[in-house]
Interface confidence: medium
């Protein structure tokens, strides 16, 4: 069995303010079991954007049915983008445990925000 890869196919996404941004992420294996989380930025100060397992993220929706056991697409859509949302977003696979532990991160997708068309 090949080791799971986290694929973020887009190095960058550019979105107009007020629109929704779709950030793509797929994994290549169902093993190991564990949730996906999305973060903005890297390191200790990174900001949690979405947690598949728990939490309330009103601006984030999943593109596919991420609750299904066999799902391998963890792309998200973030609504009503503002300039404050600019940054690099990482899709991160966790291994199930107590607590869950980080297993592998995608390469990142840089979100840039264009001015709202007048």
């Amino acid at each position: 069995e090949e080791e799971l890869q986290v694929i973020q196919p887009d190095k960058s996404v550019s979105v107009a303010a007020g629109e929704s941004a779709i950030l793509h992420c797929t994994v290549t294996s169902l093993i190991p079991v564990g949730p996906i989380q999305w973060f903005r930025g890297a390191g200790p100060a990174r900001e949690l954007i979405y947690n598949q397992k728990e939490g309330h993220f009103p601006r984030v929706t999943t593109v596919s049915e991420s609750t299904k056991r066999e799902n391998m697409d963890f792309s998200i859509s973030i609504s009503n983008i503002t300039p404050a949302d600019a940054g690099t977003y990482y899709c991160v696979k966790f291994r199930k445990g107590s607590p869950d532990t980080e297993f592998k991160s995608g390469a990142g997708t840089e979100l840039s925000v264009r001015a709202k068309p007048s």
């Epitope: 694929i7 973020q8 196919p9 190095k11 960058s12 550019s14 940054g87 690099t88 995608g106 390469a107 990142g108 997708t109 840089e110 840039s112």
Partner: antibody, heavy 118, light 108 residues
Framework: DVQLVESGGGVVRPGESLRLSCAAS????????MSWVRQGPGEGLEWVAG????????WYADSVKGRFTISRDNSKNTLYLRLFSLRTEDTAIYYC???????????WGLGTLVTVSS | EIVLTQSPGTLSLSPGETATLSCRAS??????LAWYQQKPGQAPRLLIY???SRATGIPDRFSGSGSGTDFTLTISSLQSEDFAVYYC??????????FGGGTKVEIK
């Protein structure tokens, strides 16, 4: 007209370093992800490294990871590739390539030749 | 890493004939495949993207087809300027981006 002009190639010894530059004109440089692709003598094409439109995400081929660094200066419309710890197998023409909306290459420079020889 | 295998390595044809070039991927790449032409001493030029869409300024004698793992570039009625090396490239799965080994189309 879109133009990409590489410079900085030359003859170096194994273990030495170089910095390649790619001057871009004829398009909005900061709207495009960019890549370097190389071609060894008599060989095919090999993608080397890519960078997102603001520089927040960089990707590398395994063969150069840890030895090469891609960067960009959007104020100067210039893409860079720093080559460290050069090996004889790094001998190639290095092309700067503009990425279209997805990760294929719609414009290429004419290339700059790097020769690593003792 | 997705490996792209191009065949044949060399295709010997006469002007006016049709060239059929194959590119096979080791994994499903959906329609995320491009074709490039390279002439000696020149940079590659984009011909086809998304497996079947012609790039700007590319004549309609160049056509691409396929999806998943099997792709074909067809050059109908070969012109003298079409004799070159052709490369396929997969994209859309993140790094590393990979190219096929190339097919040389030469004059018979």
């Amino acid at each position: 007209d879109v133009q990409l002009v590489e410079s900085g190639g030359g003859v170096v010894r194994p273990g030495e370093s170089l910095r390649l530059s790619c001057a871009a004109s004829g398009f909005t440089f900061s709207d495009h992800d960019m890549s370097w692709v190389r071609q060894g003598p008599g060989e095919g094409l090999e993608w080397v490294a890519g960078i997102s439109l603001r520089g927040g995400v960089t990707w590398y081929a395994d063969s150069v990871k840890g030895r090469f660094t891609i960067s960009r200066d959007n104020s100067k419309n210039t893409l860079y590739l720093r080559l460290f710890s050069l090996r004889t197998e790094d001998t190639a023409i290095y092309y700067c390539a503009r990425e279209s909306w997805n990760t294929f290459f719609d414009y290429w420079g004419l290339g700059t030749l790097v020769t690593v020889s003792s | 890493e997705i490996v792209l295998t191009q065949s044949p390595g060399t295709l010997s044809l006469s002007p006016g004939e049709t060239a059929t070039l194959s590119c096979r991927a080791s994994q499903n790449v959906r329609s995320n495949l491009a074709w490039y032409q390279q002439k000696p001493g020149q940079a590659p030029r984009l011909l086809i993207y998304d497996a079947s869409s012609r790039a700007t300024g590319i004549p309609d004698r160049f056509s691409g087809s396929g999806s998943g793992t099997d792709f074909t570039l067809t050059i109908s009625s070969l012109q003298s300027e079409d004799f070159a090396v052709y490369y396929c490239q997969q994209y859309g799965n993140g790094p590393p981006l990979t190219f096929g080994g190339g097919t040389k189309v030469e004059i018979k």
